[in-house]
């Protein structure tokens, strides 16, 4: 092996591994093993992953690339990053939607579906936390609305008779006009 910079070929390091008869240099990310090297410490024959396949790491034994995942349209998923020879498709949710994991112990590879984010404005509430990794967190009712049951109800414009206690506390000032 030429120059002193070459990684030592001892079959034990990260650079060379025994493939077939010899210790061979692995294939770079985005390439698969077509044929192992034909001499000690030689380069394997590596080919670029075909379209719609990938290999993310340097490898010594992968004789085929992994198929790129397709984002699940049924689960409203979209491709945030298209597949390349070195990285799988990154699926996620479009703006205004959030990831709802389908398993309790949620990790990056867990199955998920996309849910539309709550529109706090439509619910007449303040937006406390914007929707991204989880649903929007809505806060208190907007001015001119009061809490009633699970929702926000518009302050009445006429008599106090139709205004319960919570309404009166929030909307009482309206009666002075």
């Amino acid at each position: 092996q030429g120059g002193t910079r070459s990684p030592r070929c001892d079959c034990a390091g990260d650079f060379h591994k025994k493939i077939g008869l010899f210790c061979c240099r692995g294939c770079p990310a985005g390439h698969y093993l077509k044929a192992p090297c034909t001499e000690p410490c030689g380069n394997s024959t590596c080919l670029v992953c075909p379209q719609d396949t990938f290999l993310a790491w340097e490898n010594h034994h992968n004789s085929e690339c992994a198929r790129c995942q397709a984002c699940d349209e049924q689960a409203s998923q979209v491709a945030l990053e298209n597949c390349s020879a070195v990285a799988d498709t990154r699926c996620g949710c479009k703006p205004g939607w959030f990831v709802e994991c389908q398993v309790s112990q949620c990790v990056s590879s867990s199955p998920f579906y996309c849910q539309p984010c709550l529109d706090c404005g439509a619910l007449h509430r303040h937006t406390r936390l914007l929707c991204s990794r989880r649903d929007t967190d809505c806060g208190t009712c907007l001015p001119g609305f009061y809490e009633h049951g699970d929702g926000c109800v518009s302050c009445p414009t006429s008599t106090l008779g139709s205004c319960p206690e919570r309404c009166a506390a929030v909307c009482g000032w309206r009666q002075m006009f």
Partner: antibody, heavy 123, light 111 residues
Framework: EVQLVQSGGGLVKPGGSLRLSCAAS????????MSWVRQAPGKGLEWLST????????YFPDSVKDRFIISRDNAKNSLYLQMNSLRVEDTGVYYC????????????????WGQGTLVTVSS | DIVMTQSPDSLAVSLGERATINCRAS??????????MQWYQQKPGQPPKLLIY???NVESGVPDRFSGSGSGTDFTLTISSLQAEDVAVYYC?????????FGQGTKLEIK
């Protein structure tokens, strides 16, 4: 005692197929790479194929690549050479051989050989 | 491919005399300080027999009249005192890289 006993040779027409076998005994077969070498009548030795131990990768010269298939059955201590699309020039004595690895430099030498089996390709 | 060329093609030597066979590789067969080449003996009607490996190491069971030398591209097989049973064809072979290649053979006879 290391022994390699060959079988499967014979007369075959051009374009035909033949499967050679090599039964090994006297050593741990699965731990050795194995090879086939042939010798045309009155000629020298020609390396034909090697199959590695463990992962069973196979190697061929261009002259037989895509026509010959080497395989092994470690459970049966046997080595095989499947020869397809045979040509007149494939005629010769075929030997199986054990490849012994020497030292830590990935260096192989054929230290035991079978008795040879004659393959004749003729119309 | 590495081409192995032997000389001479045939050789006649008297019993008890020294026999020398040469082998030249078209490129170096050296790797990590070892010459990846070997010598085989083939008697009529028999398979080849390994005599020398790594250019100069005598295989177990081979008589010590056989020796090998050389490095890089030039190698020599020497039989120090020829015996009748040494009549055979001798082949050099490289294992430096695939395809493995043999020399064309040297036929050794008694003069």
């Amino acid at each position: 005692e290391v022994q390699l006993v060959q079988s499967g040779g014979g007369l075959v027409k051009p374009g035909g197929s033949l499967r050679l076998s090599c039964a090994a005994s006297g050593f741990k077969f699965s731990s050795y790479a194995m090879s086939w070498v042939r010798q045309a009548p009155g000629k020298g030795l020609e390396w034909l194929s090697t199959i590695s131990d463990g992962d069973s990768y196979s190697y061929f010269p261009d002259s037989v690549k895509d026509r010959f298939i080497i395989s092994r059955d470690n459970a049966k201590n046997s080595l095989y050479l499947q020869m397809n699309s045979l040509r007149v020039e494939d005629t010769g004595v075929y030997y199986c051989a054990r490849d012994r690895i020497y030292g830590s430099v990935q260096y192989y030498a054929m230290d035991y050989w079978g008795q040879g089996t004659l393959v004749t390709v003729s119309s | 491919d590495i081409v192995m060329t032997q000389s001479p093609d045939s050789l006649a030597v008297s019993l008890g005399e020294r026999a020398t066979i040469n082998c030249r590789a078209s490129e170096s067969v050296e790797f990590s300080g070892t010459s990846l080449m070997q010598w085989y003996q083939q008697k009529p009607g028999q398979p080849p027999k390994l005599l020398i490996y790594a250019a100069s190491n005598v295989e177990s069971g081979v008589p010590d009249r056989f020796s090998g030398s050389g490095s890089g591209t030039d190698f020599t097989l020497t039989i120090s005192s020829l015996q009748a049973e040494d009549v055979a064809v001798y082949y050099c072979q490289q294992s430096r890289k695939l395809p493995y290649t043999f020399g064309q053979g040297t036929k050794l006879e008694i003069k």
